[in-house]
Interface confidence: low
């Protein structure tokens, strides 16, 4: 049966899937508020452009009957459930916002002909790469693998003079949705990361990880894991760590490292943290202690999704183009729009680009300091601290294989 799009004659709607299974445990009313705040900004921008149109959101709530675990691992059917609701209501907006779970998004793509754009705050997995009408507003796993390969190969920086080609990956299956798919991408034998490494082993048990820290026969000095400092401490505690071990802690959606009064705990000295730049407006601010950084990023992605919808609406209306065409559905990529925190760039496949930041713990100040930044848009590493006060010998990152001799 034909679903009519509420997307013409001066009235434009975005359908927002409100799913109990979401990438981050954010109350749905907060997501709704983020959407509404975004709509207000969009209305103002359209009005300023002289476009006298109505913009609204319709919220589609799932009943959670089939899938009540509340996490993304049980979300495969939920997106389709909601699509069925839309189909029964015979009403659809110009754009679909959601779902955020990789399983849901993948399944919806598999089972439906999506002739309208879909915007997701999540869908991190490789299986959601290269989808022609999907836009992802939080860094997908593919971007992480590009950074890691780029960084592994780098050997011409004062603090990194060896190319690396080996790694351990710690993945115990209890990770958050973003970490689950980031590590999944590193584990997958077909991924870019696996393809470029000569040795990679996934550690699945706490004991495996703990043993590697002092194992003289280890095959790599580098361990990649995902989560926050507390997660690492639970695993590592105050155990001794060999001096040439480097732990890469992926913690993209966490601004706590940039707080003025944060001191790095001692167990972080062998760790490089990969996070994202919180933006200029936030770098100099004093964060309150009760900041919930992941929720901030998730809600911000929803708000930016609405702003993206507004941007595309404005562009098409100003050019006198039809909104309900395949051209509109495929247009949400290869562009920059004004997000809530500044410009947001989407790549050729509709995935958000960002500045990733690699931090180290200064042995002098016990503060997190920026070692380098990485621009995902141009796949380029930019060193920031040319003389880092590392814990590692000679203030240089060690070779990834101990005593391999000169290269």
């Amino acid at each position: 049966s034909q679903v009519s799009q509420n997307c013409h004659n001066g009235s434009y709607e975005i359908s927002v899937l409100m799913m109990d299974n979401s990438a981050f445990a954010e109350p749905l009313e907060n997501v709704e508020d983020a959407v509404n705040e975004g709509l207000e900004i969009v209305r103002g921008r359209l009005q300023n452009a002289g476009l006298n149109v109505t913009v609204n959101a319709s919220f589609m709530y799932s009943d959670g009957l089939i899938h009540n675990s509340g996490d993304c691992r049980s979300s495969t059917c939920e997106g389709l459930d909601l699509l069925r609701k839309i189909s029964n209501a015979k009403r659809m907006g110009c754009v679909l916002m959601g779902p955020s779970c990789t399983y849901s998004t993948f399944q919806m793509y598999l089972d439906t002909e999506l002739s309208y754009p879909m915007i997701s705050a999540g869908s991190f997995g490789l299986s959601c790469d290269y989808k022609e009408t999907l836009t992802r507003l939080m860094s997908p796993a593919r971007k992480l693998t590009y950074f890691l390969v780029n960084f592994w190969k780098t050997n011409d920086l004062p603090f990194k003079t060896y190319s690396w080609s080996t790694s351990y990956v710690y993945k115990n299956g209890t990770e958050s949705e973003d970490c689950f798919w980031y590590l999944n991408a590193l584990e997958a034998s077909v991924s870019y990361f696996s393809h470029e490494l000569s040795f990679k082993l996934v550690l699945r048990q706490d004991k495996e990880f703990q043993d590697i820290l002092m194992d003289h026969n280890r095959k790599s000095n580098v361990i990649v894991m995902c989560g926050g400092p507390e997660f690492l401490y639970k695993l590592k505690g105050d155990r001794a760590v060999a001096e040439d071990i480097v732990i890469i802690l992926v913690d993209l959606f966490n601004d706590q490292y940039f707080e003025d009064n944060v001191t790095a705990p001692d167990y972080m000295k062998n760790v490089l943290v990969l996070t994202q730049s919180p933006g200029n407006s936030l770098l100099n601010s004093s964060f309150s202690r009760n900041l919930s950084p992941t929720k901030r990023d998730f809600a911000l992605a929803y708000l930016n999704g609405i702003l993206l919808f507004g941007h595309m609406l404005k562009t098409f209306l100003e050019n006198g183009e039809n909104i309900t065409t395949p051209k509109f559905a495929h247009a949400f990529r290869n562009l920059t729009f004004e997000g809530y925190d500044g410009p947001v760039t989407l790549d050729d496949w509709g995935d958000v680009d960002s500045t990733m930041v690699l931090l180290y713990t200064s042995v002098d100040t016990k503060k997190y300091k920026v070692l380098l930044t990485y621009d995902t848009h141009v796949n380029q590493t930019n060193p920031v601290d040319m003389s880092p006060t590392f814990t590692w010998k000679n203030s240089k990152l060690p070779n990834d294989i101990t005593d391999r001799g000169p290269q």
Epitope: E29, N30, D33, A34, N36, E37, E40, I41, G44, S281, L282, N284, S285, S286, F287, S288, N290, L291, S292, K295, R296, A299, L300, L303, Y340, D341
Partner: nanobody, 133 residues
Framework: QVHLVESGGGVVQPGRSLRLSCAAS????????RGWFRQAPGKEREGVAT???????SYADSVKGRFTISQDNSKNTLYLQMNSLRAEDTAVYFC???????????????????????????WGQGTTVTVSS
Amino acid sequence: QVHLVESGGGVVQPGRSLRLSCAASGYTGRRLCRGWFRQAPGKEREGVATITLSGRASYADSVKGRFTISQDNSKNTLYLQMNSLRAEDTAVYFCAEVRSADAEWLNPLKCHPDRLGLAGVDWGQGTTVTVSS
């Protein structure tokens, strides 16, 4: 820290109008909202009106239809137009700013004057409004 300075208070007769202003300076970053609060003698501070960055206004029931909050982002100034003033409006009026540092910075419900937690908010020194015949 944002520096907020209120002005426009004074003594006024019931039924008359008054306009308060609040000039913000210093680091403002990305804010959730700004608002006006008041504290009558011997009472707790209460929300009067708030306005989000995009201009959505919310009012306490006691002032709805009488007070109007507005802002001029280019001048970094907040206003409160108070009409049909009553004796019970007598209080010290404070300007406040809730910034993105707040945990739920994206939740405009948090910005409603009835629900706004007072933690993580920057305050002005206050300006006194006395409604008396």
